[in-house]
């Protein structure tokens, strides 16, 4: 079943290569287990950036060695992606799945365009 997911259109990463955005979903039921996946779309290729699963009211558990961190509050997930470089500029899509209890719902946001600018190297000081 489809579910609406909202996320900002554009985010600019900071000078340390960190970008944060909120992924909000319109929960049709009372989900107790939620899964969030961040996908990156570039040149019509979609790759998984990170994935987290959590019980409502608990911390997000990011799977594998993740470059993402995050927190949840109600139907909002605050996502932070670290270690970004200019080459990582692209569209980052938030996918939310309500895993438990049935029925299963899935929603995909329109994506957040994250712009990353590599910092200029500091000039040598004499």
């Amino acid at each position: 079943k489809a579910m609406h997911v909202a996320q900002p259109a554009v985010v600019l990463a900071n000078s340390r290569g960190t970008a944060s955005f909120v992924c909000e979903y319109a929960s049709p039921g009372k989900a107790t287990e939620v899964r969030v996946t961040v996908l990156r779309q570039a040149d019509s290729q979609v790759t998984e950036v990170c994935a987290a699963t959590y019980m409502m009211g608990n911390e997000l558990t990011f799977l594998d060695d993740s470059i993402c961190t995050g927190t949840s509050s109600g139907n909002q997930v605050n996502l932070t992606i670290q270690g970004l470089r200019a080459m990582d500029t692209g569209l980052y899509i938030c996918k939310v799945e309500l895993m438990y209890p049935p029925p299963y719902y899935m929603g995909i946001g329109n994506g957040t365009q994250i712009y990353v600018i590599d910092p200029e190297p500091c000039p040598d000081s004499d």
Epitope: G29, T32, E33, E48, A51, T53, Y54, M55, T61, L63, D64, E97, M99, Y100, P101, P102, P103, Y104, M106
Partner: antibody
């Protein structure tokens, strides 16, 4: 001990419908999801769908939406699957299975299976 | 849908040997994988879940491993009762699909 007792083998005519049952015992029926599987020599094992007996919430595999209807009766600790408009493609062994934990992250597993119900569709 | 591929449809081995059965997912399933054993005319029985956790009462000669898209089930020192079919199943996104199975036969 946990037991899932499925109904007996069925021989049905094409176009007919059949209802399979799965009686659970040895645990609290409403504490665990009940899933249904189909097994054929050609397509192997396929996941049909899941029902939460507590809430009645259901998720179907899109492939079986409109073909299978899942229900659960809390008073008799029995799950049912109705299969509609049967064709030869529906001839298979059907299993009810219990998911091994109620909504705990990572506990995704079918820990108990019924003995299976053989359905043969033939005129 | 995620496609689970067990490339080896059948393999034969002798009692006492060690065998490894593999399963590949079409996308990262983050260890959300179970292995089942099925004997002829019987229902599947749980062996391993979360890719590497043994089910209750499963002998320690069975072990699961893998990550991402590649997973395997290893059986050390095969016993006569280990012969049958083995299936993997993912639990990432619905529908929760199975591999086509690997039939383990006595050599």
């Amino acid at each position: 001990q946990v037991k899932l007792q499925e109904s007996g083998a069925e021989l049905v005519r094409p176009g007919a419908s059949v209802t399979l049952s799965c009686k659970a015992s040895g645990y609290t029926f409403t504490d665990y999801e009940m899933h249904w599987m189909k097994q054929t020599p050609v397509h192997g094992l396929e996941w049909i769908g899941v029902i939460d007996p507590e809430t009645g919430g259901i998720t179907y595999n899109q492939k079986f939406k409109g073909k299978a209807t899942l229900t659960a009766d809390k008073s008799s600790s029995t799950a049912y699957m109705e299969f509609l408009s049967l064709t030869s493609e529906d001839s298979a062994v059907y299993y009810c299975t219990r998911r091994g934990a109620r909504a705990t992250v990572y506990n995704y597993v079918m820990d108990y299976w019924g003995q299976g119900t053989s359905v043969t569709v033939s005129s | 849908d995620i496609v689970m591929t067990q490339t080896t449809a059948s393999l034969s081995a002798s009692v006492g040997e060690t065998v490894t059965i593999t399963c590949r997912a079409s996308e990262n399933i983050h260890n959300y994988l179970a292995w089942y054993q099925q004997k002829q005319g019987r229902s599947p029985q749980l062996l391993v879940y979360n890719a590497k956790t043994l089910g209750d009462g499963v002998p320690s000669r069975f072990s699961g491993s893998g990550s991402g898209t590649q997973y395997s089930l290893k059986i050390n020192s095969l016993q006569p009762e280990d012969f049958g079919s083995y299936y993997c199943q993912h639990f990432w996104s619905t529908p929760w699909t199975f591999g086509g199975g690997t039939k383990l036969e006595i050599k």
